[in-house]
């Protein structure tokens, strides 16, 4: 059975968008009529890993490109970066460890916790225009919440 | 936590429409990637997997029983249900709903044992 | 579909033993595997997962190898809680089950 996916966009809890920065970061920032073709659309694969109770395991690459996001260690730090992978073999179910993140859906509310990285959350600054990161706290400065729109195919 | 039960009569007669009712709690069936399954064992036999639905209602069948079989959700009750029409002795069995986040079953419950016999 | 062979159907064992359990699958299904364990009147428990992978909470006595077709359960130092029967499934295609290894007290 073939991984199966759905195509969406992101947006914090403050409503910011995620658009490419550079070739190998994302940013957030608020983005409002034809700027919102500028967001990234995601591919989020629905891969096997540890279940629990609301949390679904999940790859994120990005739409039609060879970059998914991985968790990796950088000077001792998790860290959120954007890797290329080979198209050929990517999505696949048993996706290596540092791409998985569990989705933790309550109240049409996502966050996204590394499978590598537990307690490390994707997350987004307060202020404008800086980059989507690897945050270890919840509930304090950084937005760990997210929405998520779905893009027809 | 995660918990489901299986309910449905316990004595069904040939040719009878049989239908099972999976209640869960502990997620919801609204959540992308989430999925439940059918699963029987006759008594003393393996376990055969039936049919699955998806949170975006997307289903499947096992090939050969497929012809008799229709998966649905209430996604408000969480409750999923499974028809199979015209059943035979043979369709005796203890029948299981597990959440499948696609691949493997973590989570079962404790099934429901239903006898066909006239 | 793909078919799932199981060895042996039966096994005797004493406690503290090690255990191996295969099953083969009718075709390659690469990693896409998992083994079950289930007590009478019970509903299977799953154990492992990708063919070796270890579910939360289950003892580090499991193990699962293998790939393509051939693939093995082991239990390296049986325990009393450990009797009972063994199901392995594979999810490459529509899911398919063994028919079961039980593994009774010697």
């Known amino acids: 059975a073939p991984v199966r996916s759905l195509n969406c966009t992101l947006r914090d809890s403050q409503q910011k968008s995620l658009v490419m920065s550079g070739p190998y970061e994302l940013k957030a920032l608020h983005l409002q009529g034809q700027d919102m073709e500028q967001q990234v659309v995601f591919s989020m694969s629905f891969v096997q890993g540890e279940e629990s109770n609301d949390k679904i395991p999940v790859a994120l690459g990005l739409k039609e490109k060879n970059l998914y996001l991985s968790c990796v260690l950088k000077d001792d730090k998790p860290t959120l970066q954007l890797e290329s992978v080979d198209p050929k073999n990517y999505p696949k179910k048993k996706m290596e460890k540092r791409f998985v993140f569990n989705k933790i859906e309550i109240n049409n509310k996502l966050e996204f916790e590394s499978a590598q990285f537990p307690n490390w959350y994707i997350s987004t600054s307060q202020a404008e225009n800086m980059p989507v990161f690897l945050g270890g706290t919840k509930g304090g400065q950084d937005i760990t919440d997210f929405t998520m729109q779905f893009v027809s195919s | 936590q995660v918990t489901l039960k299986e309910s449905g009569p316990a004595l069904v007669k040939p040719t009878q429409t049989l239908t099972l009712t999976c209640t869960f709690s502990?997620?919801?069936?609204?959540?992308?990637?989430?999925?439940v399954s059918w699963i029987r064992q006759p008594p003393g036999k393996a376990l055969e997997w039936l049919a699955l639905i998806y949170w975006d209602d997307d289903k499947r069948y096992s090939p050969s029983l497929k012809s008799r079989l229709t998966i649905s959700k209430d996604t408000s009750k969480n409750q999923v249900v499974l028809t199979i029409t015209n059943v035979d002795p043979v369709d005796t069995a203890t029948y299981y709903c597990?959440?499948?986040?696609?691949?493997?079953?973590?989570?079962w419950g404790q099934g429901t044992l239903v006898s066909v016999s006239a | 579909d793909i078919q799932m062979t199981q060895s042996p159907s039966s096994l005797s064992a004493s406690v503290g033993d090690r255990v191996t359990i295969t099953c083969r699958a009718s075709?390659?299904?690469?990693?896409?595997l998992a083994w079950y364990q289930q007590k009478p009147g019970k509903a299977p428990k799953l154990l492992i997962y990708w063919a070796s992978t270890l579910q939360s909470g289950v003892p580090s006595r499991f193990s699962g190898s293998g790939s393509g077709t051939d693939f093995t359960l082991t239990i390296s130092s049986l325990q009393p809680e450990d009797f009972a029967t063994y199901y392995c499934?594979?999810?490459?295609?529509?899911?398919?089950f063994g028919a079961g290894t039980k593994l009774e007290l010697k």
């Open positions: 502990g997620f919801s069936l609204s959540t992308s990637g989430m999925g």
């Open positions: 499934q594979q999810y490459s295609s529509y899911p398919t």
């Open positions: 075709q390659d299904v690469d990693t896409d």
């Open positions: 597990a959440r499948s986040a696609y691949y493997s079953f973590a989570y």
